[in-house]
Structures are given as structure tokens and as C-alpha cells.
Interface confidence: low
């Protein structure tokens, strides 16, 4: 049978020929009658065999990391017979490892993100180096990790390459760190080879900073003419955190202002001071509000950083605007009796300059020929007034600042003209009546009514009478109905168209005014030729002709 030991050849041998070992047949008695042959990959090129002795030599420098073993076949032939002495057999030559490879970090570049202020021991990242040497051969591939750069904030576990935090870090002081890790083989013993890698460790932000106002006191100004909703200025706080952690909300502390509000511009993180209610320089010329600022998002576990909100004081000055004169009342109503003489007193309007300088005021009336106003606001008449022409006057009074004529205010003034009894009552219409020749006594000829252009204080009451002449010699009589109407009745039987075709009756109408006024009104009564039923015949023709303006004989 075949006789050999396990074959090893060290890698990286520089000699031209290195004895690996010997294989032989136990039938070989050393008389050189056997011939040994080597077959397989590497035979003849990497390994050769001494055909007589069976000694194997490596004739090439070997690299275990390229090829760690060779499987070869051996033959032995009896040269006298040419026959195989032993069956062909496979054998293995192992390339034994030397520490000729340094550890390499294959997953470079390394980058890790860890929250700032993370506690000691927090895992950051694991780095792993590879060593091409034989892990089963001694310590050639047994690695130890150490930190070359990164103290005192980081540490590395020697056997695992796990990087951990060893000291709290503040992103606001430094937001990234370069850590250099070394891996050494031979577990760090003499002759060890090493490799290094860099790890970029970025600190992610946590909300460990509250926003703080840039200024402890802000001064803003607002015009008293500014409408509600006007932005009067901005305030700004700074937060050393970033992103969502730097988003903030501004507010007025303890809601101490009904006049101003603060809204937050979430794009610029500014506080915008808004006018909530119109201001008046003459009422209050400056305001003070205290504003506070807080982060929009704060986690419960980070509340300790946000216990007391930053505050600032805002002093707001109101800018005076020249305002138009201000009337004491929004409108005025005055009364004056009709028929009072021109220059009569109507009433007084009053306007003042609301500004501090208190400019004198000038007054005027827009488009009025009936009234006048002086610089004291006194309104007088320029003509006598007649209530029956106009009972009310709607005036527009303008007040102008003496030193700034552009500052103008106008208000309506209503003047009521009060009635006096200056009109007697009169017929409410033109009356033209007729009576038949054959009319009997007491026949109703006409019902009359009256009107009075004066305004009734309570209710008009009219009194109807015939004139003295007509009372004494009248063919007609009058009865007052006591309801502002009266009836005219015949006072005799029979009338003659030929003798007296027309009667003119004077009727006196008095009112109940103080003093009472009386008017004389003429009632025309035509005598008509009537048939037996009382229907007028000639009279109708006459009336028609009269109404058309023709005179009948």
C-alpha cells in the first residue's frame, strides 16, 4: 500500500524548491525499480516529484488565500514490467497559512445617525473587518477592534466592532464626528497586521433647546388710522434646534391685550403682531404687551428643557393721524316756527378737533339759500319760512379744520318748520250746484266740505255760516253737520229761471285755530228747468255750455 503523511507547504516561500514530503509504496525496497508519477492540477508546474524516491517539491511560491489545497494523484510503476505497483491514489497538499493579510473593512464608507444627548452605551453602528488569512490557523485572522479617533464620545467593543456612545453629545455644539476604528489581527500580538476605517457619525436633533427671543424688548409703531388686522411688526425668537424641533408658536402672555394679537408665520418662524382693535392716539398713545414663545412640538420626556417659556416685552407706540372734526351728535333736529323773520335762530351744532392740537373749526352749509351758519355753529334763517311750502329742510353741515382744510366732516341737520295758523279754511273743491224751478223748501242742494292748509295741532274743526246778507235775504239756508261738512238747502218753494237764473251764495268757513281765521267762499247755484220727475233738462245744457266757456242768453 501507499505510505505518506499529511502534506503541508507554507505559503509565500521564497525558495526555488521546497520539500513538501515523500510518498512511496511499501513494496519499494529501494533498488530503484519503481517509478513515481504525479498527476492532477499543479503537477509538473507547481509540484514535482522525484520519480525514483517519491519526494515531492513545491517549485512555485504559493498563496493560501488564492488556493489553500491541491488535490493530486499519485502513481507508482514497476519499470521492469511497466505495470502499476499500487492503484492510483488521490492525496492532498494543504497550503499552510502565514499572517500575510491585514484586516480590511469591506462595507466602507460607514455612516451612522444617532440622536444627540443619547445616553452612554447607546449603540451607534457595528463595523466589521475581514481578514483573508485562515481563521482556523492560529490567530492570523482573529481580530481586535480599537478606537484611534473619537474619544471621549465613542467606544468600540474590541471583539465585535460595535461602536457605542461613551459620553453625551450636543448637536448644537458639534453635529458630526469622524471616528477612526482600527482592526488588528493576531489578537493584537506582536507581528499583527492592521487596517483602519472611518465612520461618519451624524447627530440627529432632539428638542433640547427652547426658543429664545433675540431681543428682550421690541418697539413697534401703529398708526391710529390702521384698520383691524393690520400687521404692525414682527418679533423673532431663535431656536438652536433644527427642523420640526425649531418650529415655534408665539402668543401674548396671560392674554393681556384685547388690542393686539400675535400670529406665527410658520415659514419664517416669526411672530407677527396684529392689530385686533382700532387704536386712538388721543385715548391711549402707547401700549405694552408681553409675548412668549414655545416650541410647537415638545415630547414629554424633553419637557425639562422647556419648563419656562422665553418672553419679551413689546412697546407699541401709537402714531397720531390728523383726524377730521368730530361732531358732538351724529345728526341734529331743530324746530322753528314759520313766518319768523329772517336772521332768526334755528339751533347750534358743535364739532371739535379730536387731535391734541385742537384746531379751530369752520362750519358751512352745503347748497342752502334759506339758512346760514357762523363759525360758532349757529344756524339762522336767511328768509322767512312757510311751512305750507316746505315743512322740513334736510341740510348738510360741514365742519372743516381751520389749519387743514382737507380735514372735513359732514352731518345731516333736519329743520322742522312748525305751523302757525296763517291759513283760513276754504272749499275743498270748486262747487257749482243747481236747483229745479219747482223745487220745494228744505230740499238739499249741495253738501260742501272744507280744507285748511295749516297743520292741525289736534284736529281741524270748521264752522260753516251764510254771510250776513245771505242770511237775511237768502233763498237758501245752511246746516253745519259738525263733521267739517255742511249742507245747502232751499229756503223757499219755487224758482224762476227767467227772473233769477243764478244765485251766488257767500259761505263763511271758520277754523278752530287761535286766533280763528275765516274765509268767504262763493257757491254758484243754477236754476234749472226740470221735468216732473226732477230731472234737469235745460239746466244740463246750460251747464255743459258753461263748462265749455260759452255764455248762454
Amino acid at each position: 500500500g501507499w505510505v505518506w503523511n499529511q502534506f503541508f507547504v507554507p505559503e509565500e516561500m521564497n525558495t526555488t524548491s521546497h520539500h513538501v514530503g515523500r510518498l512511496r509504496s511499501d513494496l519499494d525496497n529501494g533498488n530503484n525499480s519503481f517509478q513515481y508519477k504525479l498527476l492532477g492540477a499543479g503537477a509538473g508546474s507547481t509540484f514535482i516529484i522525484d520519480e525514483r524516491t517519491g519526494d515531492i517539491y513545491a517549485i512555485e511560491k504559493l498563496d493560501r488565500e488564492e488556493r489553500s489545497l491541491y488535490i493530486l494523484r499519485a502513481q507508482v510503476i514497476d519499470i521492469t514490467t511497466g505495470r502499476a505497483v499500487e492503484p492510483e491514489s488521490e492525496f492532498v497538499i494543504k497550503v499552510s497559512d502565514i499572517n500575510d493579510n491585514e484586516p480590511k473593512f469591506l462595507d466602507e464608507p460607514y455612516e451612522a445617525i444617532v440622536p444627540e444627548m443619547s445616553p452612554e452605551g447607546t449603540l451607534v453602528i457595528q463595523v466589521t473587518a475581514s481578514d483573508a488569512d485562515d481563521p482556523s490557523s492560529g490567530n492570523n485572522a482573529r481580530l481586535l477592534y480599537s478606537l484611534l479617533q473619537g474619544q471621549p464620545y465613542f467606544s468600540v467593543e474590541p471583539t465585535t466592532g460595535v461602536i457605542r456612545i461613551s459620553s453625551k453629545m450636543d448637536r448644537e455644539l458639534q453635529d458630526e464626528y469622524w471616528v477612526i476604528i482600527q482592526a488588528k489581527d493576531m489578537i493584537g500580538q506582536p507581528g499583527a497586521l492592521s487596517g483602519t476605517t472611518s465612520v461618519l457619525i451624524k447627530l440627529s436633533d432632539v428638542n433640547d433647546n427652547k426658543p429664545i427671543f433675540k431681543e428682550s424688548l421690541y418697539r413697534l409703531t401703529v398708526s391710529e388710522s390702521a384698520p383691524t388686522g393690520t400687521s404692525i411688526g414682527t418679533i423673532m425668537a431663535y431656536d438652536n434646534d433644527i427642523g420640526e424641533n425649531a418650529e415655534m408658536d408665539y402668543s401674548i402672555e396671560e392674554d393681556d391685550s384685547q388690542t393686539f394679537d400675535i400670529i406665527t408665520n410658520h415659514e419664517t418662524q416669526e411672530g407677527i403682531v396684529i392689530l385686533k382693535k382700532k387704536v386712538n392716539f388721543e385715548h391711549q398713545n402707547h401700549y405694552g404687551i408681553r409675548a412668549k414663545v414655545k416650541n410647537h412640538h415638545v415630547d414629554e420626556q424633553l419637557m425639562k428643557y422647556h419648563t419656562e417659556a422665553s418672553t419679551t416685552f413689546i412697546k407699541i407706540q401709537v402714531e397720531d393721524v390728523d383726524e377730521p372734526p368730530l361732531f358732538l351728535l351724529p345728526y341734529y333736529i331743530f324746530e322753528i316756527f314759520e313766518e319768523t323773520p329772517q336772521g332768526s335762530f334755528v339751533g347750534v351744532v358743535s364739532a371739535t378737533d379730536p387731535d391734541n392740537r385742537k384746531s379751530p373749526i369752520r362750519y358751512s352749509i352745503t347748497r342752502s339759500k334759506v339758512f346760514n351758519i357762523d363759525d360758532n355753529g349757529t344756524i339762522t334763517t336767511t328768509n322767512s319760512l312757510d311751512r305750507e311750502i316746505s315743512a322740513w329742510y334736510n341740510l348738510s353741515i360741514t365742519a372743516t379744520e381751520k389749519y387743514n382744510i382737507e380735514q372735513i366732516s359732514s352731518i345731516p341737520v333736519y329743520v322742522q318748520v312748525l305751523n302757525i295758523n296763517d291759513h283760513a279754511p276754504e272749499f275743498s273743491q270748486y262747487y257749482e250746484s243747481y236747483v229745479c224751478e219747482n223745487a220745494g223748501s228744505g230740499q238739499v242742494i249741495q253738501t260742501i266740505s272744507a280744507v285748511d292748509r295749516d297743520e292741525s295741532i289736534e284736529e281741524h274743526h270748521f264752522y260753516f255760516n251764510l254771510s250776513v246778507e245771505d242770511t237775511n235775504s237768502s233763498s237758501f239756508t245752511i246746516i253745519d253737520n259738525q263733521d267739517n261738512t255742511a249742507v245747502i238747502l232751499t229756503n223757499r218753494t219755487g224758482f224762476n229761471l227767467q227772473e233769477e237764473p243764478i244765485f251766488y251764495i257767500s259761505i263763511l268757513i271758520a277754523d278752530n285755530g287761535i286766533p280763528s281765521l275765516t274765509s268767504t267762499n262763493t257757491l254758484t247755484i243754477h236754476v234749472c228747468d226740470c221735468d216732473d220727475s226732477g230731472s234737469t233738462q235745460t239746466c244740463q245744457y246750460q251747464e255743459l255750455m258753461l263748462s265749455m266757456g260759452f255764455k248762454t242768453e
Epitope: 431681543e215 428682550s216 421690541y218 418697539r219 409703531t221 402707547h286 407706540q317
Partner: antibody, heavy 119, light 107 residues
């Protein structure tokens, strides 16, 4: 005439208190915001505190906040500065000053009163 | 806070000469809220200029102020004997801060 007169200054030990007064005359005291300003050889002029015309708002410099209190009595035309927990660095001449109505600069100053904090 | 730096520290001039005092702010002073004061030994400061360029009541027209933003100047066109004093600038746009002063002395 229009004037401000301070009083109440003196020598005091650190940690002790002092109350300064400022008497106003010749103008409508209740219409003006009033301030205290101090002057030290080392730091020059330094604003200390302000109080609104009606006493509704008060504001302090960071260096004195929590220790000093500004107040006023409009019926007596007097401004006060209560100084507690005094420190050596509070040694200065203290002036009361009137703020103008239309701005925030000081158009009227008192002659000042010296406060010395020394052990 | 806004820091005001005055220069020069001391200005030695003769009566009748022109004095130019500078005041520089560490950041822009809003709306030219800058005032100048004069202080004589043992006296309170006296307001000279407000709003960077407006003369206070009763101040002679030889005193003038100019500037905006961060650079301001007080000019005394012809120095009178009573003008020799210490001059302070003050900003009132953001809280109140004063410059360290410029002493104008007789040469």
C-alpha cells in the same frame, strides 16, 4: 420749573436693600413713562428699568431683574426704585429720566444720587 | 443687545474748530432710533439730538446729527467753550443701550 430730583442714595453692604425716590415737578408726571438709568466709571451709562405712565407695565435690565422693583405714585408725582440683594457691581450714580411721549429717548434727567455697595 | 461703539475716545480741539463724533452700532438701528446726549462733570446728561438728526428743544443749531443703519455722526460746527464735555450716543430701537462716550477736551 420742570425738574427731577433723586434721593435715597448712600453706602450699603452687599446683600442689603435701598430705596431710591425721584420727585417730579413742573410737568404732568402721570402722562410720562419714567426710567432709571445708572452710570458707573467702568460700564458707563446703563439703562436699569422703565415704568409705564399709569404703572401698568414695568420692565427691567437683565442685570437687575428679580432684585430691583420700579414703582410710582402719580398722586405724589414720585418715582421709586426698590433695590434688594445689592451687589458691589450695583455701585453707581442712579438717575431718573423722563421718556418722551413720541419716542423712547430721555428728554429730562435728574442730577442723580450715588449708591455705593461695599463691605 | 445692540452694542454702540464711539470713536474717538478723546477729541482734543480748540474753540471755533469743527468736531465730528462717530457712533457705530453692532447691528442696524431701526427707524434711526438714535439719540445724542451731552454730559458735563457732576451733571446729568442732556438731550441734544433724537431720531438721529432732529435737534431737541433749545439746542443750538451748531449741533447736528446724521446717519442711519449702523453708522451715525454728531457734528459740532464751531466749538464754543461750553461745548467741552463728554458726548454719549444711545439707541432706543431695541431696549436702551449707550455708547461708552467721547470726551471733547480743550487742546
Amino acid at each position: 420749573q420742570v425738574q427731577l430730583v433723586e434721593s435715597g442714595g448712600g453706602v450699603v453692604q452687599p446683600g442689603r436693600s435701598l430705596r431710591l425716590s425721584c420727585a417730579a415737578s413742573g410737568f404732568s408726571f402721570s402722562s410720562y413713562d419714567m426710567d432709571w438709568v445708572r452710570q458707573t466709571p467702568g460700564k458707563g451709562l446703563e439703562w436699569v428699568a422703565v415704568i409705564w405712565y399709569d404703572g401698568s407695565n414695568k420692565y427691567y435690565a437683565d442685570s437687575v431683574r428679580g432684585r430691583f422693583t420700579i414703582s410710582r405714585d402719580n398722586s405724589k408725582n414720585t418715582l421709586f426704585l426698590q433695590m434688594n440683594s445689592l451687589r458691589v457691581e450695583d455701585t453707581a450714580v442712579y438717575y431718573c429720566a423722563r421718556e418722551t411721549g413720541e419716542g423712547w429717548y430721555f428728554d429730562l434727567w435728574g442730577r442723580g444720587t450715588l449708591v455705593t455697595v461695599s463691605s | 443687545e445692540i452694542v454702540l461703539t464711539q470713536s474717538p475716545g478723546t477729541l482734543s480741539l480748540s474753540p471755533g474748530e469743527r468736531a465730528t463724533l462717530s457712533c457705530r452700532a453692532s447691528q442696524s438701528v431701526s427707524s434711526s432710533y438714535l439719540a445724542w446726549y451731552q454730559q458735563k462733570p457732576g451733571q446729568a446728561p442732556r438731550l441734544l439730538i433724537y431720531g438721529a438728526s432732529s435737534r431737541a428743544t433749545g439746542i443750538p443749531d451748531r449741533f447736528s446729527g446724521s446717519g442711519s443703519g449702523t453708522d451715525f455722526t454728531l457734528t459740532i460746527s464751531r466749538l464754543e467753550p461750553e461745548d467741552f464735555a463728554v458726548y454719549y450716543c444711545q439707541q432706543y430701537g431695541s431696549s436702551w443701550t449707550f455708547g461708552q462716550g467721547t470726551k471733547v477736551e480743550i487742546k
